[in-house]
């Protein structure tokens, strides 16, 4: 069965948008006006995972690119990366665990917890123009709350 997907953009709780920074990295910065066109559009796919009543497993691909956010160990630390995949095989309902994030909605904000590394979240820095990363703390300096904007196909 084709996996159910929707197109969206994400902004962190400080209203920073996500843009490409080189071929395999995202960064977060404030955008206005025509610059908003730079923000990445995600194809969010609803996949199998350890679903609960308040966690929905999703995969986050870049629209019309064969790139997916994934979580891997680098130097013994959970790390967020953009990983290239074979477009003939992705997206799929049974994504490998490193591609799966638990989408958690709290007070109209979204968190994205790594399925591979529980309690590690897609995060941005307070500072402008810094890479999007996988952070192991919530409620500290780094930002783990996002809003989602739907984009028509």
């Amino acid at each position: 069965a084709p996996v159910r997907s929707l197109n969206c953009t994400l902004r962190d709780s400080q209203q920073k948008s996500l843009v490409m920074s080189g071929p395999y990295e995202l960064k977060a910065l404030h955008l206005q006006g025509q610059d908003m066109e730079q923000q990445v559009v995600f194809s969010m796919s609803f996949v199998q995972g350890e679903e609960s009543n308040d966690k929905i497993p999703v995969a986050l691909g870049l629209k019309e690119k064969n790139l997916y956010l994934s979580c891997v160990l680098k130097d013994d630390k959970p790390t967020l990366q953009l990983e290239s995949v074979d477009p003939k095989n992705y997206p799929k309902k049974k994504m490998e665990k490193r591609f799966v994030f638990n989408k958690i909605e709290i007070n109209n904000k979204l968190e994205f917890e790594s399925a591979q590394f529980p309690n590690w979240y897609i995060s941005t820095s307070q500072a402008e123009n810094m890479p999007v990363f996988l952070g192991g703390t919530k409620g500290g300096q780094d930002i783990t709350d996002f809003t989602m904007q739907f984009v028509s196909s």
């Epitope: 199998q48 609960s52 309902k93 049974k94």
Partner: antibody, heavy 122, light 107 residues
Framework: EVQLQESGPGLVKPSETLSLTCTVS????????VSWIRQPPGKGLEWLGL???????YYNSPLKSRLTISKDTSKSQVSLKLSSVTAADTAVYYC????????????????WGQGTLVTVSS | DIQMTQSPSSLSASVGDRVTITCQAS??????LNWYQQKPGKAPKLLIS???TLPPGVPSRFSGSGSGTDFTFTISSLQPEDFATYYC?????????FGQGTKLEIK
């Protein structure tokens, strides 16, 4: 060898809370989810909900407001609590181990307990 | 929720017969379908996972096929110990849902 065993009172009064325990061996509750299923006398199987290795829970909608599933990993026990019971909750209650094979069979159930009959009656 | 329609609800057959039970899903579930056998007073036992895979120790007279929405469970040659109730389960999405069951009786 994987084993699951349900235990709890066989008789519960209407409006009270049904409490059952599933004691497991042969696998760790850190690594595998456990589901609860029930079967009213002479009827089919109804899936109630599950608890994952992480401790996160998923409850089937019709029972969501009355159902609580929790676990004590160190005791290898999973608990089910169903509040405000009526005669319609009379059933054999089973716990079952989730297959938990990512990318293959994440949601299937491979081993079941023998079940325990709970009667709701005053 | 995904609805599972199992048929027939009951079936009479003799030892040595070939028996087929079907299960239809209300939406495409790929191959995420399990079959269970339940004998009176006992817990269900997994016979087939992922539509066609036999777990270790399950006799080869049991088989499963299908994908998408239509699935079939077959016993190639009925044995006396096979008289029981059989259930399908979709394990594609939560909540998990069972078919209504097929009671296999001796003719």
């Amino acid at each position: 060898e994987v084993q699951l065993q349900e235990s709890g009172p066989g008789l519960v009064k209407p409006s009270e809370t049904l409490s059952l325990t599933c004691t497991v061996s042969g696998f760790s509750l850190r690594d595998y989810g456990v589901s609860w299923i029930r079967q009213p006398p002479g009827k089919g199987l109804e899936w109630l909900g599950l608890i994952w290795g992480s401790g996160d829970t998923y409850y089937n909608s019709p029972l969501k407001s009355r159902l609580t599933i929790s676990k004590d990993t160190s005791k290898s026990q999973v608990s089910l609590k169903l509040s405000s019971v009526t005669a319609a909750d009379t059933a054999v209650y089973y716990c079952a181990k989730q297959t938990n094979i990512w990318g293959y069979d994440l949601y299937g159930m491979d081993y079941w307990g023998q079940g325990t009959l709970v009667t709701v009656s005053s | 929720d995904i609805q599972m329609t199992q048929s027939p609800s009951s079936l009479s057959a003799s030892v040595g017969d070939r028996v087929t039970i079907t299960c239809q899903a209300s939406q495409d579930i790929d191959m995420d379908l399990n079959w269970y056998q339940q004998k009176p007073g006992k817990a269900p036992k997994l016979l087939i996972s992922q539509a066609n895979t036999l777990p270790p120790g399950v006799p080869s007279r049991f088989s499963g096929s299908g994908s998408g929405t239509d699935f079939t469970f077959t016993i190639s040659s009925l044995q006396p110990e096979d008289f029981a109730t059989y259930y399908c389960l979709q394990s594609d999405w939560l909540p998990l849902t069972f078919g209504q069951g097929t009671k296999l009786e001796i003719k």
